[in-house]
């Protein structure tokens, strides 16, 4: 083989016979070149008489290898470890669609073994998001979908969402749902979900923030129940009465709509007028009684009190001595059934 420095490498290496094929204790791992920092690839095999790196099918120059050798205490067989550095320039110089790769080849007297291929990529994270979240105004208890497509990057960016700069954890708040395509779903928007939401994309190179989307959770106003009708404006006859309601069930919040319709209702009313009671004329005096008194009466019926009118004041009955204080009537006359009763006389 020919290395990149034009130096010949043997196709096989001599070694003592009867060894097993090399076995890799450590294989090179995929790696990313961040900014201009080269990556180190490591390889360890045993038993191994020689171990070299091959990158993109070409042997790496021997001077590019840092090799260490040790003995396995149990078997006494040689363990070989090798390390190389791959620079950004080397990776950039590889033209074509294929990724830059390296693998280890280890030799023993029984033959060669190849390690896995480790792919080396230049890490980056573009500046602009493919899709940024948009501001939303949603009614209370409704669903919200915020979309985010992070910038292209290698390795692919991880995405997290911030609510007012705090990381959203759907395991802690099950009202949030994160999807594989980086959408954030608010299952039932609460007033406390009114906030600024930011999509954050990050990888080993950088961290990018999307524009912030303000989500406003609003409440449309709702009417309270109607209050009782007010008393009629006129105590007597035709008037008006009204009842009111307020836009407080709930009150509009965060720009929610005010209640539609009237806060006050008016209607005509007629109240029957109260009629105060008045006395009838006094009756004629009664006949003189055994007690030498006569009586007269009247009624609160001219008219009677109506619709809450006042009752008559004064007495129903009036009595007066009918003999000017002399009560000496003939016993017989008073007791004679044939005797005429006393005529009632006027006042």
């Amino acid at each position: 083989g020919i290395d990149s420095g034009g130096q010949a490498l043997p196709d096989s290496f001599p070694s003592a016979p009867a060894e097993q094929l090399p076995h890799f204790l450590l294989e090179p791992e995929d790696a990313y070149i961040v900014k201009n920092k080269p990556v180190e690839l490591h390889c360890r095999a045993f038993p191994a008489t020689q171990i070299y790196f091959k990158c993109n099918g070409e042997w790496v120059s021997q001077k590019g290898h840092v090799t260490q050798e040790s003995l396995d205490e149990a078997t006494g067989l040689r363990i070989r470890e090798v390390q190389i550095e791959v620079s950004r320039q080397q990776v950039e110089e590889l033209f074509g669609l294929e990724d830059y790769w390296c693998q280890c080849v280890a030799w023993s007297s029984s033959g060669t073994t190849k390690s896995r291929r480790a792919y080396i990529r230049i890490a980056y994270l573009r500046k602009n998001f493919d899709q940024e979240p948009l501001a939303k105004e949603v009614p209370l208890d409704h669903e919200v979908l915020l979309q985010c497509r992070p910038p292209e990057g290698v390795p692919v960016a991880e995405v997290e969402w911030l609510k007012n700069e705090d990381v959203i954890d759907p395991a802690q708040d099950t009202n949030f749902l994160l999807t594989i395509d980086h959408n954030l779903i608010i299952r039932q928007a609460r007033l406390s979900d009114t906030a600024n939401y930011t999509c954050v994309a990050k990888n080993i190179v950088a961290k990018r923030r999307s524009t912030t989307a303000t989500v406003i959770v609003y409440v449309n106003g709702g009417w309270s129940s109607w209050a009782e009708w007010s008393p009629c404006s006129n105590r007597c006859g035709r008037g008006w009465q009204k009842r009111t309601r307020t836009c407080t069930n709930p009150a509009p919040l965060n720009g929610g709509a005010f209640c539609e319709g009237q806060a006050c209702q008016k209607t005509a009313c007629t109240t029957v007028c109260p009629v105060d009671g008045a006395w009838t004329e006094w009756s004629k005096w009664s006949a003189c009684s055994t007690e030498c008194a006569h009586w007269r009466s009247r009624e609160c019926m001219a008219p009677p009190p109506q619709n809450g009118g006042r009752d008559c004041s004064g007495t129903l009955l009036d009595s007066k001595n009918c003999t000017d204080g002399l009560c000496v009537l003939n016993q017989r006359t008073l007791n004679d059934p044939k005797s005429r009763p006393l005529e009632p006389s006027g006042d």
Epitope: K136, E143, L145, L146, L177, L178, T179, I180
Partner: antibody
Framework: EVQLVESGGGLVQPGGSLRLSCAAS????????MHWVRQAPGKGLEWVAS????????SYADSVKGRFTISADTSKNTAYLQMNSLRAEDTAVYYC????????WGQGTLVTVSS | DIQMTQSPSSLSASVGDRVTITCRAS??????VAWYQQKPGKAPKLLIY???SLYSGVPSRFSGSRSGTDFTLTISSLQPEDFATYYC????????FGQGTKVEIK
């Protein structure tokens, strides 16, 4: 009260088209994602498509991509599933469901694709 | 797509039994898993969302839990009305459902 009512199912020949409707009441469809899920006779549930009108977001299962189109008319509070190039394997009861939690479902409408 | 492997496919149980149904996601789905109950000729009904949150109106004998990519639905004491088919569903990626578990009377 939240209600979803599907309609538009029926018998159609392979290669034919059908448009399913999902009339929503009791909530504003504009602010919710709506989903179509189907169930072949005697089989399990399979998600078909989703829409979220407010964000102009749509998504489809690979099995229907390019053949089915989900849409919504928010003035009618109705979601639709336009199904073209129908195949025998599309035979199923089609349900519409509300929100990512799929908390409310319609009663379903049967689509039979057969010659 | 993310696969949801549900087990068992069917089970026989008696009223009062404790019943456990499991679902394993083929990759991480966070806690974006829901459980549904379906009776013959009827639409599915939501029982559990976000792996462990009980949906309103669902009896407290139903519960959900998560351990990594394994999700469990437990019915603590089976009632006559619980005999049905149960499905798990993930909503982290494009929605996928488990194959279903039919709970039958022993």
């Amino acid at each position: 009260e939240v209600q979803l009512v599907e309609s538009g199912g029926g018998l159609v020949q392979p290669g034919g088209s059908l448009r399913l409707s999902c009339a929503a009441s009791g909530f504003n469809l504009y602010y919710y994602s709506m989903h179509w899920v189907r169930q072949a006779p005697g089989k399990g549930l399979e998600w078909v498509a989703s829409i979220y009108s407010y964000s102009s977001y749509t998504s489809y299962a690979d099995s229907v991509k390019g053949r089915f189109t989900i849409s919504a008319d928010t003035s009618k509070n109705t979601a639709y599933l336009q199904m073209n190039s129908l195949r025998a394997e599309d035979t199923a009861v089609y349900y519409c469901a509300r929100s990512y939690a799929m908390d409310y479902w319609g009663q379903g409408t049967l689509v039979t694709v057969s010659s | 797509d993310i696969q949801m492997t549900q087990s068992p496919s069917s089970l026989s149980a008696s009223v009062g039994d404790r019943v456990t149904i499991t679902c394993r996601a083929s990759q991480s789905v966070s806690s974006a898993v829901a459980w549904y109950q379906q009776k013959p000729g009827k639409a599915p009904k939501l029982l559990i969302y976000s792996a462990s949150s009980l949906y309103s109106g669902v009896p407290s004998r139903f519960s959900g839990s998560r351990s990594g990519t394994d999700f469990t639905l437990t019915i603590s004491s089976l009632q006559p009305e619980d005999f049905a088919t149960y499905y798990c569903q993930q909503s982290y990626g494009p929605f996928t459902f488990g194959q279903g578990t039919k709970v039958e009377i022993k």
